[in-house]
C-alpha cells in the first residue's frame, strides 16, 4: 500500500523533538501554496490553502513519519497554527511507483484577504533540541477580491464580487451618454462616471430595493467627445459603503433606432477598491 | 526483462568530450532513478550522478559537477552522460546502472570503454 | 561523503571455505548498504541490498548481516564461480560511495 497522509491540528512542540535522534530524515524538496475554494454545509464557500510539499529521494525517507506544518498570518492581528500529517505507511521505495517525487498535500488554514502568510514545513524526527533542523519555508500573500478564487468569500460576495452589472453605454449625441446596467439585489445606490484623462460626466444612480436583478438605465450629461471613454460603476452597498467593486465599460456609438444595441465586449472590467 | 544497452566505446583526444548514451527496455522508464559510475583500468567503482526520468531532476557527485551533463529522451527511455574536457585520467569503462526502489544499483549496462589518447 | 573501508582487499581461499569480508561506513548508514560482484571484462552484478536481502537469483550461500557502521559479507561455502572482486556500497543520500572492493582468489 502506498503511503497517505492524516493531518491533525498540532500546537505544542512534537513529542518526537524531546528525544535524542541519531538519524533523522532529510528535508523537504518542494514546498507551495495556493488558495482552494471548498464548499461548506450552509451552501456558502470558504476559502483555504492547499499546501503541497515534495519529498527528496533518497534513502532518508524511510525515517520519516510525519511533516508538520505551521502558519503564521500578519494582517490586523497575528494567527499562529500547526497542523501535523502523519504517514500512514512506511517508505518501500524513495520515488513513487509510477515514477516522480513522493508528493502530499493538506487542505485547511483558512485564508484571510490581502493576508501576508509565513508557512514552514519540515518532516519527523527532527533534529535534535540543540541542532538546527532541515526545514523549508515561503511567504504567501492573499489576494482581494478581485482574485477568481478569493472572490467566493462572504466579504467579497457582499462587496459585490459576482455581480456582473453587464454595462452598455453609448454616446447618444455630443451632449449625452446613455448607461445601462443590470442592478444587484445587495443595494440601490450607485454612481456611474464617464472619463477620458478627467472626469467628463457623472450622475448618481438610486433605484428601488428590488430582491431581483433588473436592467437600469441612466442618461448622462458630458462635457467632451465621450466615444472611446471609460465608464466606471461603483456602487454603494451597506455591507461594504465606499469599499465596492467598481465596475469597467467602454462608450460605444448609439446604434440606430431599431438596431439591437451593441453589447460592449470591455464591459464588467473588474476595477479594484476605491481608494 | 529489464535491459540497459550502452553505445559503444569511443577514443577521445584530451580537451574533447564524449556522450554515452543508455537504451532501457522491460520497465517503466521513469519510474526509477538513473545512475553513472565509472571504472578506472584495474580500479574501484566510482558514482558520478543520477537522473530522474520522471522530471530530470539532477544530483551529481561534486567531483564532476563542472563537467558532467546528464539528460534523458522519456520518448525513447534512453539516459545520456556527458563528460567534457576530457582529461587521461578519465580513461575508464562508463556504466548506466537502474536504482531498486532505493539507490542499490539492480540492473547495469554492460559498460562503454572511453579512452583518452593524445 | 561518507567513506566505505573494505578489508581485507584480497584474500585466497579454497572451494568450500567460508569467507568474510566486511565493510566499515565512515557514519551510521542506517543498513542503507548494497554488495556486489564483478567478474573481469563484467559489469558489477547486485548480490545483497539493505545489508541482507538477496537480490533475484543470488544463491543463499550469500549472507550479509550488521547495523550502524559495522557490515559483513558472508559466503558460506565458496564456489568455483563465486572468485571475483566484491564491492560494498552505501545508499543512505548522494553521494553514493563504494568500498575499495576485495578481491577473492583461489588459493
Known amino acids: 500500500r502506498e503511503p497517505t497522509v492524516q493531518c491533525g491540528s498540532e500546537t505544542g512542540p512534537s513529542p518526537e523533538w524531546m528525544l535524542q535522534h541519531d538519524l533523522t530524515p532529510g528535508d523537504l524538496r518542494d514546498l507551495r501554496v495556493e488558495p482552494v475554494k471548498t464548499s461548506v454545509a450552509t451552501g456558502d464557500y470558504s476559502i483555504l490553502m492547499n499546501v503541497s510539499w515534495v519529498l527528496r529521494a533518497d534513502a532518508s525517507i524511510r525515517l520519516l513519519k510525519a511533516t508538520k506544518i505551521c502558519v503564521t498570518g500578519k494582517s490586523n492581528f497575528q494567527s499562529y497554527s500547526c497542523v501535523r500529517c502523519n504517514y500512514t505507511e512506511a517508505f518501500q521505495t524513495q520515488t513513487r511507483p509510477s515514477g516522480g517525487k513522493w508528493t502530499f498535500s493538506y487542505i485547511g488554514f483558512p485564508v484571510e484577504l490581502n493576508t501576508v502568510y509565513f508557512i514552514g514545513a519540515h518532516n519527523i524526527p527532527n533534529a535534535n533540541m540543540n541542532e538546527d533542523g532541515p526545514s523549508m519555508s515561503l511567504n504567501f500573500t492573499s489576494p482581494g477580491c478581485l482574485d477568481h478564487i478569493m472572490k467566493y468569500k462572504k466579504k467579497c460576495v457582499k462587496a459585490g464580487s459576482l455581480w456582473d452589472p453587464n454595462i452598455t453605454a453609448c454616446k447618444k449625441n455630443e451632449e449625452t451618454v446613455e448607461v445601462n446596467f443590470t442592478t444587484s439585489p445587495l443595494g440601490n445606490r450607485y454612481m456611474a462616471l464617464i472619463q477620458h484623462s478627467t472626469i467628463i460626466g457623472f450622475s448618481q444612480v438610486s433605484e428601488p430595493y428590488q430582491n431581483k436583478q433588473t436592467r437600469a438605465s441612466v442618461v448622462i450629461p458630458v462635457t467632451e467627445e465621450s466615444e472611446g471613454a471609460m465608464v466606471q460603476l461603483t456602487p454603494y452597498f451597506p455591507t461594504c459603503g465606499s469599499d465596492c467593486i467598481r465596475h469597467k465599460g467602454t462608450v460605444v456609438l448609439c446604434p440606430q433606432t431599431g438596431v439591437p444595441f451593441p453589447l460592449d465586449n470591455n464591459r464588467s472590467k473588474p476595477g479594484g477598491w476605491l481608494p | 526483462q529489464v535491459q540497459l544497452v550502452q553505445s559503444g566505446a569511443e577514443v577521445k583526444k584530451p580537451g574533447a568530450s564524449v556522450k554515452v548514451s543508455c537504451k532501457a527496455s522491460?520497465?517503466?522508464?521513469?519510474?526509477?532513478?538513473m545512475n553513472w559510475v565509472r571504472q578506472a583500468p584495474g580500479q574501484g567503482l566510482e558514482w558520478m550522478g543520477r537522473?530522474?526520468?520522471?522530471?530530470?531532476?539532477?544530483q551529481y557527485n561534486q567531483k564532476f559537477k563542472d563537467r558532467v551533463t546528464m539528460t534523458r529522451d522519456t520518448s525513447i527511455s534512453t539516459a545520456y552522460m556527458e563528460l567534457s574536457r576530457l582529461r587521461s585520467d578519465d580513461t575508464a569503462v562508463y556504466y548506466c546502472?537502474?536504482?531498486?526502489?532505493?539507490?542499490?544499483?539492480?540492473?547495469w549496462g554492460q559498460g562503454t570503454l572511453v579512452t583518452v589518447s593524445s | 561523503d561518507i567513506q566505505m573501508t573494505q578489508s581485507p582487499s584480497s584474500l585466497s581461499a579454497s572451494v568450500g571455505d567460508r569467507v568474510t569480508i566486511t565493510c566499515r561506513a565512515s557514519?551510521?548508514?542506517?543498513?542503507?548498504l548494497a554488495w556486489y560482484q564483478q567478474k573481469p571484462g563484467k559489469a558489477p552484478k547486485l548480490l545483497l541490498y539493505?545489508?541482507?536481502n538477496l537480490a533475484d537469483g543470488v544463491p543463499s550461500r550469500f549472507s550479509g548481516s550488521g547495523s550502524g557502521t559495522d557490515y559483513t559479507l558472508t559466503i558460506s561455502s565458496l564456489q568455483p564461480e563465486d572468485f571475483a572482486t566484491y564491492y560494498c556500497?552505501?545508499?543512505?543520500?548522494?553521494?553514493?560511495?563504494f568500498g575499495g572492493g576485495t578481491k577473492v582468489e583461489i588459493k
Open positions: 546502472a537502474r536504482s531498486g526502489g532505493f539507490d542499490w544499483f539492480a540492473y
Open positions: 522491460g520497465y517503466t522508464f521513469i519510474s526509477y532513478w
Open positions: 537522473i530522474d526520468p520522471y522530471d530530470s531532476e539532477i
Open positions: 557514519e551510521n548508514i542506517n543498513s542503507n
Open positions: 539493505d545489508v541482507t
Open positions: 556500497q552505501h545508499f543512505w543520500g548522494p553521494p553514493y560511495t
